[in-house]
């Protein structure tokens, strides 16, 4: 028995089209994705085979303009009109909290939401229950598949859940639910899902009957043969994982953005044991026809954000690389960019001993989600903005201890190369990392701009020292594993929201051309 | 065609222990999973265990955990139950099921257990 | 007693529309989903609706199933008099993990 499994995951809000790097389509001879080209391709492959699901394995939530509008709406909207037959949460989904996930996704999503390690308690567990499903069998061609979903047990650290769901580790919550499965006469069982590639792996190795794993939350581009645009694969699709009783378990994913529709074609034998599997991510580029009446859809939805979004606030003469494979690697202009409209938006309380009462940003790359193109006359909106600052998040002021500052950075790149987001971009700083050294003791050099002179130049971090920091909100609450900072800081005052920080910056100065300038070093 | 044929029911004295059989025949027995099912004389269907197609793992209903243990032998295509420490509330007609979805689901005859002094 | 429960009979005449319910709870049909079976007198057990909604091949459009939260229900409409059967609803309770069955309900038809 053959089955097609379509998937997609991070999509991050991409509704329309967009440039090859994911940010706003500037050329649309050359532009990607978006939910009506997706449609399209959908809609072909179901004609053509007999079999086919159509899941996304989370991050729907948070990327561009249209999540700051709609909040969700878009989302439940689309991907019903897309006849998704599955989701699992993924961590942004709770970005709003879970009053913006029940609302606008939950109630009105027309498909089954997974995740069989989130727990409710409290009032919330009735409200939820019949919303969040942990598993759902769905039957095509007189046949059954259940799809147990899983989300990452981190969301609590990457998002704002709340404190009445806990998320449990994922192997520990999946294998009940699959041995309940099979129990119930389910013996083709797929792991759907968003907690990383290691994690994917990991559930295909240690959960005992399942059969496939479709992923998401690390954005992994696999591929057999030659890629087709500019993402290199972290391996073959799919891949294949050697389970503990000795199964091969196609583990796969879509990289992100709605740029590819992840295609896999998996034949079951009689007792629901997979006997082959193959495909490939299939990318979305403009030979494949956006549908039109999706399309006109999207344009009907479209005038609420034109009027919200479209004035220009000032010209970049420069490409601003707020691109995942910079940002959370090396230093990158994008980053020196806001770092210093977060240091320019606090400038005050000067006097003849201070230049200001605050010189140092620093701002986790993970949280750049998007670069913007100078090729489009220059021009930077409200818009742009808010594909590069999705989350609505505000830049606070802490004070920390020049002890605490030096965790953070050992924490920048205790896991350096995985492309996770808590890499650091800097402003008023200067860093110097060996990773040829062990994680806890990368940091070389770690100089800081002073502030107490007249003259701003950089000095050796001290230990025993307390500076003010400007940083998102998200680190200052321990987002991406800074606990450090959470845990340490010794003043905390909320700040303004980060795109207006950011777009008053750039109205001010009218053009910008953030360089990369040796902020961030390694020896 | 799919058949499944219980065995080894009969009269037995309280405390007693009883072993059931079940033979498949007309389909691949170990792609699924299997439950026994009982009915009291002119009551309802009450579960009563249920094996994995692995047979890794097993469920058992509280009123007979740890009395009763189901197993399987996928090379004879049999289900087994094995009932000790019998009681009068254990008499039923026990039938062999594929409980599941869809064409999945198939219930043998049953195979009636008396447990009486 | 079981977890699910139903009416322990049901009646109807020829060509009326009967409706049969089974009420459970969140760890059993809140979270799982619901078959339907008829059992004739002195037969086995035989699947008519599954994944909460589903018809198995063969069996007549007049037998429809439903779930809303923690209920499930099975309506037969258009009566025949071979309809008359004692019918159960089933699903896997995950507070006790394993399948539960309705007490049944008798249909008699007038």
């Known amino acids: 028995w053959e089955l097609t499994i379509l998937h997609t995951n991070d999509v991050h809000s991409r509704l329309e089209q967009t440039s090859e790097d994911s940010s706003k389509c500037v050329n649309a001879s050359r532009c990607m994705g978006g939910v009506a080209r997706l449609f399209t391709k959908v809609q072909q492959i179901r004609r053509a085979e007999p079999n086919v699901l159509l899941l996304d394995a989370g991050d729907q939530y948070q990327g561009t303009i249209w999540f700051t509008v709609y909040k969700g709406a878009e989302v439940a909207h689309f991907m019903n009109a897309l006849r998704y037959d599955a989701m699992a949460l993924g961590n942004h989904e709770f970005d709003n909290g879970v009053e913006g996930l029940i609302e606008p996704l939950l109630k009105e999503a027309k498909f089954p939401i997974l995740s069989a390690n989130i727990k409710a308690k409290g009032p919330l567990a009735s409200q939820i229950s019949g919303l969040v499903h942990p598993y759902k069998i769905l039957h095509i061609d007189s046949e059954v598949v259940g799809i147990v979903g899983y989300t990452s047990k981190e969301t609590p650290f990457l998002s704002n859940p709340g404190t009445n769901l806990v998320f449990e580790d994922e192997i520990t919550a999946l294998q009940p639910e699959v041995d309940k499965l099979t129990a119930m006469g389910v013996n083709k069982i797929i792991a759907l899902g968003h907690s990383g590639f290691e994690m994917d792996k990991l559930i295909a190795q240690k959960v005992r009957g399942v059969d496939v794993v479709v992923g998401g939350h690390s954005n992994t581009f696999l591929y057999t043969g030659n890629p087709p645009s500019k993402e290199v694969p972290a391996g073959k699709y799919p891949f294949i994982v050697t389970s503990d009783d000795g199964r091969k378990v196609p583990v796969v994913q879509a990289y992100a953005f709605g740029k590819y529709l992840g295609y896999l074609k998996i034949e079951f034998d009689e007792r629901g044991n997979v006997i082959s599997s193959h495909g490939n991510p299939i990318l979305l580029n403009s030979s494949i026809p956006e549908d039109p009446s999706i399309k006109a859809d999207i344009n009907k939805w479209r005038i609420k954000l034109d009027n919200y979004s479209t004035q220009e606030l000032g010209k970049t003469i420069v490409y601003l690389d707020g691109s995942s494979q910079s940002c959370r690697f090396r230093e990158c202009n994008m980053g020196n960019l806001i770092c210093d409209a977060m240091i320019n938006n606090n400038l005050r309380h000067a006097d003849e001993m201070f230049w200001n009462h605050v010189s140092m940003c620093i701002l986790n790359g993970g949280g750049i989600r998007s670069p913007i193109d100078e090729r489009n006359n220059g021009t930077i909106t409200w818009e742009n903005l808010a594909a590069v600052l999705p989350f609505g998040g505000t830049f606070d002021l802490v004070q920390l201890k020049g002890s605490t500052l030096k965790k953070a950075f050992e924490h920048s790149v205790h896991r350096y190369g995985q492309s996770t987001g808590e890499f650091l971009q800097v402003g008023g700083i200067h860093v110097v990392y060996d990773l040829s050294r062990k994680p806890g003791d990368r940091v070389v050099k770690l100089d800081v701009l002073c502030t107490k002179c007249r003259v701003p130049s950089y000095d050796p971090l001290k230990m025993d020292e307390v500076y003010k920091v400007i940083l998102p909100n998200f680190l200052a609450n321990g987002g991406d594993g800074f606990q450090m900072i959470k845990d340490e800081l010794l003043r905390h005052d909320s700040g303004d929201q980060d795109i207006n920080v950011v777009s008053t910056y750039i109205s001010k100065m009218k053009v910008i051309y953030p360089a990369v300038e040796g902020r961030i070093k390694f020896s | 065609e799919v058949q499944l044929l219980e065995s080894g029911g009969g009269l037995v004295q309280p405390g007693g222990s009883l072993r059931l059989s079940c033979a498949a025949s007309?389909?691949?027995?170990?792609?699924?999973?299997y439950s026994w099912v009982r009915q009291a004389p002119g009551k309802g269907l009450e579960w009563v265990s249920a094996?994995?197609?692995?047979?890794?793992?097993?469920y058992y209903a509280d009123s007979v955990k740890g009395r009763f243990t189901i197993s399987r032998d996928n090379s004879k295509n049999t289900l087994y139950l094995q009932m000790n420490s019998l009681r009068a509330e254990d008499t039923a007609v026990y039938y062999c099921?594929?409980?599941?979805?869809?064409?999945?689901?198939?219930w043998g005859r049953g195979t009636l257990v008396t447990v009486s002094s | 007693q079981s977890v699910l429960t139903q009416p322990p009979s049901a009646s109807g005449t020829p060509g009326q529309r009967v409706t049969i319910s089974c009420s459970g709870s969140?760890?059993?049909?809140?979270?799982?989903?619901v078959n339907w079976y008829q059992q004739l007198p002195g037969t086995a057990p035989k699947l008519l609706i599954y994944l909460d909604n589903l018809r198995l091949s063969g069996v007549p459009d007049r037998f429809s199933g439903s779930k809303s939260g923690t209920s499930a229900s099975l309506a037969i409409s258009g009566l025949q008099s071979e309809d008359e059967a004692d019918y159960y609803c089933?699903?896997?309770?995950?507070?006790?993990?394993?399948?539960?069955f309705g007490g049944g309900t008798k249909l008699t038809v007038l």
């Open positions: 089933a699903t896997w309770d995950d507070s006790h993990p394993g399948w539960t």
């Open positions: 094996i994995s197609g692995s047979g890794g793992r097993t």
């Open positions: 007309g389909f691949t027995f170990s792609s699924y999973a």
């Open positions: 099921a594929r409980l599941g979805y869809g064409r999945v689901d198939e």
């Open positions: 969140l760890s059993n049909i809140g979270r799982n989903p």
